[in-house]
Structures are given as structure tokens and as C-alpha cells.
């Protein structure tokens, strides 16, 4: 089949990194600078992805493979193939339309990306707060007060007036 196909279509003999040049009697010509063909038998080479602006080059374009971009420092990739970059924030912050903002009380973000999430409500699982939450860290839930025999632990349950998961202001 391959022999038959190549007799019918001389372009099928053109390897990756070349294109079948109709202007030159269908001979295989190398891809021009800043273009590539990743498969054989191509009639054109594709323009290389250009990594500039917020993007930086992770892998250079070659005659047989496209360039790959990632984001410049202070930004992180979003979307398939890093189609977009988004500004990093600090832990304890989230990105809003007006820039990086601290997490509201009762929420946290332990990454440089993403949104602030509510602290775990320990009482929903019948547990108590072992370590208070911060802007950067979730609360740590411990055993429920009923599970602790008197004097067995130095952890003091939060005062009844305070919601579980809240840290002192």
C-alpha cells in the first residue's frame, strides 16, 4: 500500500521537517525558518508558536516540532497547552479583578494560585479544632472532646462562643 501511495502521491515521501513544494515540481523542501512539520507528507509547514509577552520559551521550535511556552516568573499557566497566564499571588491571598487580595477571615489559600477556601468546619464531623486556621492554612481537626478522657490531652476545645475553625483575631 505504501508503495502504491507513493507512486500516486510523491508528497508522501516528504519526511517531517519538510513540505511538498508545489512550486518546485513537488520536491521535498525544508521548512522555512520559524516553521515546522511534525509529520511526513505535508504540503505546508506550520508557523511556530511565538513565546513572548507573558510567555517564555520552554522548548524551542525545530523543523519537526512546535515551540512550547510557559509563563514568565510571577505568573502560572492556565488552560490546555498554557493558553493563558495568570498572575501569582502570595499564599494567604487570591487574585481578584483588582489584583491580589488577602483571604477573608475564615478562609485560606495555601497556594500561589486559586481562590481562598473556607476553613474546615470540624464540628460537622463531630471533631474539635486542634490547630487554628490562618489565611495560609486550614484548621487541623482533632478528636471530638467526648473522645478525650479527662487529663489525656492538653488540647483545650475552643470557647463555646467562638465558631469552630476561627482563629483569635
Amino acid at each position: 500500500f505504501e508503495r502504491t501511495r507513493s507512486l500516486q502521491d510523491p508528497c508522501s515521501n516528504c519526511p517531517a521537517g519538510t513540505f511538498c513544494d508545489n512550486n518546485r515540481n513537488q520536491i521535498c523542501s525544508p521548512c522555512p525558518p520559524n516553521s515546522f512539520s511534525s509529520a511526513g507528507g505535508q504540503r505546508t509547514c506550520d508557523i511556530c508558536r511565538q513565546c513572548k509577552g507573558v510567555f517564555r520559551t520552554r522548548k524551542e521550535c525545530s523543523s519537526t516540532s512546535n515551540a512550547e511556552c510557559d509563563c514568565t516568573p510571577g505568573f502560572h499557566c492556565l488552560g490546555a497547552g498554557c493558553s493563558m497566564c495568570e498572575q501569582d499571588c502570595k499564599q494567604g491571598q487570591e487574585l481578584t479583578k483588582k489584583g491580589c487580595k488577602d483571604c477573608c477571615f475564615g478562609t485560606f489559600n495555601d497556594q500561589k494560585r486559586g481562590i481562598c477556601r473556607p476553613w474546615t468546619n470540624c464540628s460537622l464531623d463531630g471533631k474539635s479544632v486542634l490547630v487554628n486556621g490562618t489565611k495560609e492554612r486550614d484548621v487541623v481537626c482533632g478528636p471530638s472532646p467526648a473522645d478525650l478522657s479527662p487529663g489525656a490531652s492538653s488540647v483545650t476545645p475552643p470557647a463555646p462562643a467562638r465558631e469552630p475553625g476561627h482563629s483569635p483575631q
Epitope: 520559524n34 505546508t44 506550520d46 508557523i47 511556530c48 508558536r49 511565538q50 513572548k52 509577552g53 507573558v54 510567555f55 505568573f75 488552560g79 490546555a80 497547552g81 493558553s83 493563558m84 497566564c85 495568570e86 498572575q87
Partner: antibody, heavy 119, light 106 residues
Framework: EVQLVESGGALVQPGGSLRLSCAGS????????MHWVRQAPGKGLEWVAD????????YYVDSVKGRFTFSRDNARNSLYLQMNSLRIEDTAVYYC????????????WGQGTLVTVSS | DIVMTQTPSSLSASVGDRVTITCRAS??????LNWYQQKPGKAPKLLIY???SLQSGVPSRFSGSGSGTDFTLTISSLQPEDFATYYC????????FGGGTKVEIK
Amino acid sequence: EVQLVESGGALVQPGGSLRLSCAGSGFTFSNFWMHWVRQAPGKGLEWVADISGDGSEKYYVDSVKGRFTFSRDNARNSLYLQMNSLRIEDTAVYYCARDAMRGGDLDYWGQGTLVTVSS
Amino acid sequence: DIVMTQTPSSLSASVGDRVTITCRASQSISSYLNWYQQKPGKAPKLLIYAASSLQSGVPSRFSGSGSGTDFTLTISSLQPEDFATYYCQQSYSTPHFGGGTKVEIK
């Protein structure tokens, strides 16, 4: 509030030179790539050039390479487009625009300045 | 260069109509496609970035879709202020704009 204001447009003869300026305000100027885009009378938009935040990287459309030079002065929050060997086909409104620094889109534009090349 | 072909070049529509503008790239550009609106004598205004993300402050009647080579800008219910010219722009490589689509009052 982000603002971009172009200036320097004028009537110039073919072969002449002109320098356009763009003043930016309301954002950290040096953090952003910036672009020039032009529009010939009654025609569509044509990207002309862009420049990195520190001015070390510059790219141009083929039709202006070797004739136009894009530069910036971050201390003055200003961009400059030095246009030499001007041709009749360079006649256009020239806009400066800010790269949004997320995917190559231009999120803020100036009001434009008209360059007319005619004898 | 990557050529961006917009269709139609102009269209007539009425207030309340659903309007669709298409943009085709001469090769795959993933989702590196942006849409702008321009009114006479004014600078372009960004509507959609990364093919489908709505720019802050732009009404939700504008939406974008597509990836690879074929992209669409849709105005779900045309308003009087939407009569303008719309441009697509690829940011995959050296930026290029489509030829524009003028939306006129029927």
C-alpha cells in the same frame, strides 16, 4: 485608571521622519509589554510592533523592519516610535496599546494619533 | 504569516437579533484568539480574550467560542450600542487581525 495618550502625529513627506510618543499612567508601566497598532483610513487594524517591559525585546511587522524603531523610557512612563523613510502606505492612525500579560490580548488602547505621508 | 479570515465582511441586523461572526485561521492557533469592537473615530475595545473569556466590564450578551482554526463571536441580543466593526486577532505568533466585520442597522 489606566490611560494611554499618543502624540506626535503630523503631515510628512515621503522619505521623511517622525517620532510618535505614548504616555502611560494608572499602572506599573515597566511590568507590561506594549504594542503599536495602526489603521489606514477606512481600512482594518494592522499590528506594527511590540516591546518588552524592560525594552530588551522588540518585534516588528515585516513592512516596517529597518525603518521603524520602538523604544521606551520607563522612568517617564513613555513609549516612542521612531519612523524613518516614511512611505505613503504608512499613512494611518497609530494606536499604542497595553498587552494584558495573560494571552497576547490588548486590554487598553490610546485614542490614536494620525500620521499622513503625502507629497 | 498566519492569515485571519473574517466572515461576513458586513451584515445588517436589527435590535434584539442574534448575531454571529466567524474568524478562520490559516493554521491551528489553539485558543490564542481575541475579539475587539471598534466604533467610528474611536480606539478598539477588547471584548473576548483566549477565544472564550469575557473581558471585565463587557456585557454578557457577548460570547466567544472555538479553538484550532475556527472561532465565533456571538451577540445574543443586539443592542443599539453594538452597531460597530468587530475584529479578531491571533496572538499565537506575530499578531494579525482579521479584516473586520461591520455590523449595521437593518
